[in-house]
Interface confidence: low
């Protein structure tokens, strides 16, 4: 700035203000004096001449500097704007990240809750399954107990099948019919024991003229032994008749036991055919002779287990054992209570 100030001062001196050129003298003193003055003059004029070009250059330089500065400034502004934009974007991203984090936390907690609910429901289902299985077992047990009770109740009963019906029938008439059967088929039994009957009746109790076959007669003895003696005697005799016509004597069993006995049918027939001397014993046990011993079987599964170690027997009973068993625990039918 100082330099500029001097120049401006020099610039203010005009030509009219400068003295006219002096004559040159040859004396050293005057020569010196002339030289100094002349030098001053030259400096002044030279300054004036060089001053404008220098200034012009200076202004041009400064202009370029300003231009450069402006460009730098613009660049800076652009950079600031970009930075601001980036910052804004970063802030938005940060907000989004926070929101996503919150959403994730929320979803996570919801998933946790759903998991809780699912596991609670699974627990409930397992509990229900357990209860269901337990209930099924209980029902099975109850049905078995009921079957056993019925069989126990019916133990002293004898069932007479195929005895013709007459128009007027009462207890006494049926009792006489039984005495006739005993006399005709088991005279020894009639002599041996006093046949004591607790009750005797047709079943079902209601008579229907539409029935093709006579209703069964249920005889309830006071003692089980009497019933068993009669059954044994009937087995030994092979053919039981009434007035010459064939009739059948069987134990009076519960519907379930009858079903269980029926299920032994195919197996029984095969064993009978092959001379294994099968028998169905009370209430529904299958027995037959194998390896010189009498073997007893409560159900098909027990027999299955037995034949696994006996290939010949397994082959023999293969089909009969694989046949799908009817539901053993059917709804209980009405039993004739005796």
């Amino acid at each position: 700035m100082g330099k500029k100030q001097n120049r401006k001062t020099g610039n203010s001196k005009t030509q009219s203000a400068s003295p006219p050129p002096k004559e040159r003298s040859s004396s050293p003193a005057t020569e010196q004096s002339w030289m100094e003055n002349d030098f001053d003059e030259l400096r002044e004029e030279g300054f004036r001449r060089s001053n404008y070009s220098e200034l012009r250059e200076d202004i041009q330089t400064k202009g370029k500097e300003v231009e450069n500065f402006e460009k730098n400034l613009e660049e800076c502004i652009t950079r600031i704007t970009n930075t601001e934009k980036c910052l804004k974007e970063l802030m938005e991203l940060k907000t989004k990240a926070r929101e996503l984090r919150e959403e994730c936390r929320s979803l996570r907690s919801r998933c946790d809750q759903l998991e809780e609910r699912v596991s609670a429901m699974e627990d409930e289902m397992n509990e229900m399954k357990r209860e269901g299985k337990f209930r099924e077992k209980r029902i099975k047990r109850n049905e078995q107990s009921l079957q056993e009770i019925w069989d126990y109740v019916k133990r002293p009963n004898l069932r007479l099948i195929g005895v013709p019906e007459s128009d007027v029938e009462n207890g006494t008439k049926l009792e006489n019919t039984l005495q006739d059967i005993i006399q005709e088929n088991f005279p020894n039994l009639a002599r041996q024991a006093n046949v004591q009957i607790q009750e005797i009746q047709r079943t079902p109790q209601r008579y229907s003229s539409r029935r093709a076959t006579p209703r069964h007669i249920i005889v309830r003895f006071t003692k089980v032994e009497m019933k068993e003696k009669m059954l044994r005697a009937a087995r030994e005799k092979g053919r039981v008749t009434l007035k010459g016509k064939p009739i059948r004597l069987t134990a009076d069993l519960s519907a379930e036991t009858l079903q269980a006995r029926r299920e032994w049918g195919p197996i029984f027939n095969i064993l009978k055919e092959k001379n294994f001397q099968p028998r169905i014993s009370y209430p529904a046990k299958l027995s037959f002779i194998s390896e010189g011993e009498i073997k007893y079987f409560i159900d098909k599964q027990m027999l299955r287990d037995f034949v696994t170690t006996r290939p010949a027997l397994k082959e023999l009973l293969k089909e009969a054992l694989n046949m799908e068993r009817n539901n053993r625990y059917q709804p209980l039918q009405n039993h004739a209570k005796m």
């Epitope: 936390r105 929320s106 979803l107 919801r110 809750q113 809780e116 609910r117």
Partner: nanobody
């Protein structure tokens, strides 16, 4: 569209109890986080309590903590607010709210659905 209907608002003496109930219709309540807000005359609406979808997480404002209990019955589509040891400063209109995305730090803006409100006055 989910609709919320509050009931149970009443005039009660200080120290007394009140049970507010909110019935949710037009949607399954178990799909929503539920909450209660209140607004006293001349004051901002403020958060009272909220409960998560399954009811496993609950939140209470400091002013009601220990006195109010929030519960829900998803089978009946209801949310209840049991208010005990009521104070005069509990006097306000109580609003039932529902939110799709339950947050552990609920703000008023988060809640998507609002009921009409029920007046509770503690004298």
């Amino acid at each position: 569209q989910v609709q919320l209907v509050e009931s149970g608002g009443d005039l009660v003496q200080a120290g007394g109890s009140l049970r507010l109930s909110c019935a949710v219709s037009g949607g399954t309540s178990s799909n929503y986080g539920m909450g209660w807000f209140r607004q006293a005359p001349g004051k901002e609406r403020e958060f009272v309590s909220s409960i998560s979808w399954s009811g496993s997480r609950t939140l209470y404002s400091d002013s009601v903590k220990g006195r109010f209990t929030i519960s829900r019955d998803n089978a009946k589509n209801t949310v209840d607010l049991q208010m005990n040891s009521l104070k005069p400063e509990d006097t306000a209109v109580y609003y039932c709210t529902a939110v799709r995305e339950y947050r552990d730090y609920p703000q008023r803006d988060n809640f998507d659905y609002w009921g009409q409100g029920t007046q509770v006055t503690v004298s």
